[in-house]
């Protein structure tokens, strides 16, 4: 860029040391240097302003996006806490239902045992009743009475 | 820095107002000022360019990081939704199992009641049968028939 | 700004081409231009430094915020994994409890069937016993024996 040119031409100003006056060419070299520097600075100012504005714009977009992301993260954190509570309640409920099932199972097991006992009792009752029925004399026909009648008659 | 030096030495240029010509020393002072300003500007340009480059680099890293973090957040949000659905299904299932258990319990309770009734009936049957057996005349030995036989004989 | 003024006045330096010397006014114009440029550069340096400092400040806060948000996101991700594991265990447990309930239900159903059978048996036993009791001769008063006694007497 114009700025990066070294104005080393200034070192050769007025090679005639005896002269007390400035040469017009020297002044023109100076004026040209000043003009170049001015333009260089103008370009740089313009370019730098633009770049800094771009940076601020980008930073502002980041700022907004960052804020939104922070909100979203906080929201997720909240929902996750809620989910954790729900899961805990579910675990508790699940445990209750499991205990309920175990209790039911225990009740059922004892009921099964009692049912077996009841079945045995009923079976025994049936046998008893069967024996009783088989050994039961027919009311109008007692064999002893019949034989006695025959004997008496 | 060189930039911050105030070029106030210019104010003392050519103290001889009558002279229409510029003194070489004055021009050399000017040339020196211009040289210093040029160097100062060159340094500042160099430094500013470096800083702006650093900033843009940092911004690019932020950009990438931000994008990744946003993706991660969206991913977490999605997984959280999925987890929410799973948890909801679990709640429904848990409710179903709980209702199933309650229904089972209700069935079991009524079965227990019926079992008690059945036990009572069986007990009553046993008592009846026991009475019947105890009161049953031994078929070959009716006491009346025996006494009658004796009487007749 | 001072920088944006174009130093076009330099073009009219020393209209007398024959003169080999520099006019004091020309040098003063140059000196003034140099002074203005110096001040302009000083202002711009100051302003740019301030803006770049602001940007770096913003970037540092972002850096910190970004780091914290990343940590928070990682934390949420971890907790979410943990929650996922817990939910999976819950699903397994829920399935177990469901199977337990189904098994219980199956046991209960078969128990209900056996209870119905048992009820039928008990009912049949009751009927049998009722019949037996109704048809049972009163031990001290067999009608045949009574009639036989009468006959014999």
């Amino acid at each position: 860029s114009r700025i990066d040119q070294d104005n080393s031409s200034f070192d050769s100003l007025s090679p005639e040391p005896k002269s007390r006056f400035a040469m017009l060419d020297d002044v023109k070299i100076l004026a040209n240097g000043l003009l170049q520097l001015g333009h260089g600075l103008k370009d740089f100012v313009h370019k730098t302003k633009g770049q800094i504005n771009d940076i601020f714009q980008k930073l502002n977009i980041f700022d907004q996006s960052f804020y939104d992301l922070s909100l979203q993260t906080s929201e997720i954190k909240e929902e996750e806490k809620e989910l954790r509570r729900t899961t805990y309640k579910l675990q508790v409920k699940n445990e209750e239902v499991k205990n309920m099932s175990l209790e039911l199972n225990s009740k059922l097991e004892s009921l099964l045992e009692e049912k077996i006992l009841l079945q045995q009792k009923v079976k025994y009752l049936e046998e008893q009743l069967t024996n009783l029925i088989q050994n039961q004399p027919e009311t109008p026909e007692h064999p002893e009475v019949t034989s006695l009648k025959t004997f008496v008659e | 820095s060189r930039i911050d030096q105030d070029n106030s030495s210019f104010d003392s240029l050519s103290p001889e107002p009558k002279s229409r010509f510029a003194m070489l020393d004055d021009v050399k002072i000017l040339a020196n000022g211009l040289l210093q300003l040029g160097h100062g500007l060159k340094d500042f340009v160099h430094k500013t360019k470096g800083q702006i480059n650093d900033i843009f680099q940092k911004l690019n890293i932020f950009d990438q990081s931000f994008y990744d973090l946003s993706l991660q957040t969206s991913e977490i949000k999605e997984e959280e939704k999925e987890l929410r659905r799973t948890t909801y299904k679990l709640q429904v299932k848990n409710e179903e199992v709980k209702n199933m258990s309650l229904e089972l319990n209700s069935k079991l309770e009524s079965l227990l009641e019926e079992k008690i009734l059945l036990q009572q009936k069986v007990k009553y049957l046993e008592e009846q049968l026991t009475n019947l057996i105890q009161n049953q005349p031994e078929t070959p030995e009716h006491p009346e028939v025996t006494s009658l036989k004796t009487f007749v004989e | 700004s001072r920088i944006d003024q174009d130093n076009s006045s330099f073009d009219s330096l020393s209209p007398e081409p024959k003169s080999r010397f520099a006019m004091l006014d020309d040098v003063k114009i140059l000196a003034n231009g140099l002074l203005q440029l110096g001040h302009g550069l000083k202002d711009f340096v100051h302003k740019t430094k301030g803006q770049i400092n602001d940007i770096f400040q913003k970037l540092n806060i972002f850096d910190q915020s970004f780091y914290d948000l990343s940590l928070q996101t990682s934390e949420i991700k971890e907790e979410e994994k943990e929650l996922r594991r817990t939910t999976y265990k819950l699903q397994v447990k829920n399935e177990e409890v469901k199977n337990m309930s189904l098994e219980l239900n199956s046991k209960l159903e078969s128990l209900l069937e056996e209870k119905i059978l048992l009820q039928q048996k008990v009912k049949y036993l009751e009927e049998q016993l009722t019949n037996l009791i109704q048809n049972q001769p009163e031990t001290p008063e067999h009608p045949e024996v009574t009639s036989l006694k009468t006959f014999v007497e």
């Epitope: 502002n60 922070s70 | - | 602001d54």
Partner: antibody
Framework: EVQLVQSGGGVVQPGRSLRLSCAAS????????MHWVRQAPGKGLEWVAV????????YYADSVKGRFTISRDNSKNTLYLQMNSLRAEDTAVYYC?????????????WGQGTLVTVSS | DIQLTQSPSFLSASVGDRVTITCWAS??????LAWYQQKPGKAPKLLIY???TLQSGVPSRFSGSGSGTEFTLTISSLQPVDFATYYC?????????FGGGTKVEIK
């Protein structure tokens, strides 16, 4: 040099309105979020409201929500606070302040403050 | 909302003393805390932001530390210009909140 010059304070009756202004210079106004903070006599600082760079996003303290409106005119480098339905408890010195970044608001430059007295 | 509690409310000290002010947050705010100095009739002035970064132009005798819920502002050697009221402010989330303030007086 960053400067925030405030105006618009004064004595006002309860239920009436007032508009505060804050003129900014020495920085690119549109690049910064701006806040209003107040301080009741002898009390601590209380944040009132914020407006983001572009003027689109605004947030308020619960105590002023629905009554106060923050706004900005980037072309005029000016920040405003429109205060309606004023109450005695709104009596305070009101400060405008610039922040470094708005998602993590650090207030690096403040105005000189303007006193608002709500009294009948 | 995040509450900030400052301790002590008043502090009497002499020039050259080491002074420590504490600020507690009602919930974790990472390092998002700023410290301000306010002199009577003047606007607050930013001293420290994100817990420990010194604002440009602030003397190095001021320092900040802490993270999470407990933060401290330390003045290593109190100077006559340091007699003022100090406020902490959380910059973690809106609404912004300030501590109640700590008034540092000459003993």
């Amino acid at each position: 040099e960053v400067q925030l010059v405030q105006s618009g304070g004064g004595v006002v009756q309860p239920g009436r309105s007032l508009r505060l202004s804050c003129a900014a210079s020495g920085f690119t106004f549109s690049n910064y979020g701006m806040h209003w903070v107040r301080q009741a006599p002898g009390k601590g600082l209380e944040w009132v409201a914020v407006v983001w760079y572009d003027g689109d996003n605004k947030y308020y303290a619960d105590s002023v929500k629905g009554r106060f409106t923050i706004s900005r005119d980037n072309s005029k480098n000016t920040l405003y606070l429109q205060m309606n339905s004023l109450r005695a408890e709104d009596t305070a010195v009101y400060y405008c302040a610039r922040d470094i970044i708005t998602s993590r608001p650090t207030l690096d430059y403040w105005g000189q403050g303007t006193l608002v007295t709500v009294s009948s | 909302d995040i509450q900030l509690t400052q301790s002590p409310s008043f502090l009497s000290a002499s020039v050259g003393d080491r002074v420590t002010i504490t600020c507690w947050a009602s919930q974790g705010i990472n390092s998002y805390l700023a410290w301000y100095q306010q002199k009577p009739g003047k606007a607050p002035k930013l001293l420290i932001y994100p817990a420990s970064t010194l604002q440009s132009g602030v003397p190095s005798r001021f320092s900040g530390s802490g993270s999470g819920t407990e933060f401290t502002l330390t003045i290593s050697s109190l100077q006559p210009v340091d007699f003022a009221t100090y406020y902490c402010q959380q910059l973690n989330s809106y609404p912004l909140t300030f501590g109640g303030g700590t008034k540092v007086e000459i003993k």
